[in-house]
């Protein structure tokens, strides 16, 4: 038993290692972006007795804007370094619980399904406002992530459903 | 709707580059994660590289350390950067868009794309 794809969370992208049952994974706030205080993002693929559905549990993550980073630009894209992802200090202790953020309070919710991401409409004579900003899924190739401004993904081949041949980049991981 | 357009391909020699583009319209471009697949003649369509609307990227095996995918959401526009060509990167190469996975970054059934570009022609000579 395998779970789908999990949800998309507004300003953050998850690194899928395992769709296994009780596989957890962490999301990583999107830059410019952090984990607001007391919200996790953790998430863990679960089985729901009554239906013998698996699904992935709802994290409570909110990604907020970083004032620290409202007046820097953006790193450019490169092969190792892409999305400039801010490390968050979560770590996951025994007990399954993590540690709360220290970073200021928002009110950036978490989609339970494809996040809406505030931007503007594509027009073809207008240029909207920036804003980086997506989703993912599984079931694509396999490979191993490279260093950004955190650590590595850690990742092998068991390690993951996905098949060989596809490589992340630009990603942090935060446990 | 949105509504997607490559550039940039063209004939290269083995060795050399080029930059692909596919300009978006429609929709609200930052809300999607971007891949470009490509297709030889007589083979499947494949995924070559995808960056997430956080910016993340995710390659092919076959092409990471030659191949640079990148976005501008101020220009609705994503790019393929495409050096160290080789005859066998010759293929037609499409752009497309993914809104509800929009933040996974290693995503990349072609299932999971909404809105796909006509594709422009890449061809590597030896």
């Known amino acids: 038993i395998t779970c789908p794809p999990p949800m998309s969370v507004e300003h953050a992208d998850i690194w899928v290692k395992s769709y296994s049952l009780y596989s957890r994974e962490r999301y990583i706030c999107n830059s410019g972006f952090k984990r607001k205080a007391g919200t996790s993002s953790l998430t863990e693929c679960v089985l729901n007795k009554a239906t013998n559905v698996a699904h992935w549990t709802t994290p409570s993550l909110k990604c907020i804007r970083d004032p620290a980073l409202v007046h820097q630009r953006p790193a450019p894209p490169s092969t190792v370094t892409t999305a400039g992802v801010t490390p968050q200090p979560e770590s996951l202790s025994p007990s399954g619980k993590e540690p709360a953020a220290s970073s200021p309070s928002s009110n950036n919710t978490a989609a339970t399904t494809a996040a809406i991401v505030p931007g503007s409409q594509l027009m073809p004579s207008k240029s909207p406002s920036t804003g980086t900003t997506e989703i993912s899924s599984h079931e694509s190739s396999h490979g191993t992530p490279s260093q950004t401004t955190a650590k590595n993904w850690e990742l092998t081949a068991s390690a993951s459903h996905q098949p060989p041949g596809v490589y992340p980049q630009g990603h942090s991981d935060t446990t | 709707e949105v509504q997607l357009v490559e550039s940039g391909g063209g004939l290269v020699q083995a060795g050399g580059s080029l930059r692909l583009s596919c300009a978006a319209s429609g929709g609200t471009f930052s809300s999607y994660a971007m891949g470009w697949f490509r297709q030889a003649p007589g083979k499947e369509r494949e995924f070559v590289a995808r960056?997430?609307?956080?910016?993340?990227?995710y390659y092919a095996e076959s092409v990471k350390g030659r191949f640079t995918i990148s976005r501008d959401n101020a220009k609705n526009t994503v790019w393929l950067q495409m050096n160290s060509l080789k005859p066998e990167d010759t293929a037609a190469y499409y752009c497309a868009a993914d809104r509800k996975y929009a933040g996974h970054i290693n995503y990349t059934p072609l299932t999971s794309y909404d809105y796909w570009g006509q594709g422009t022609q890449v061809t590597v000579s030896s």
């Open positions: 960056v997430t609307w956080g910016a993340n990227t």
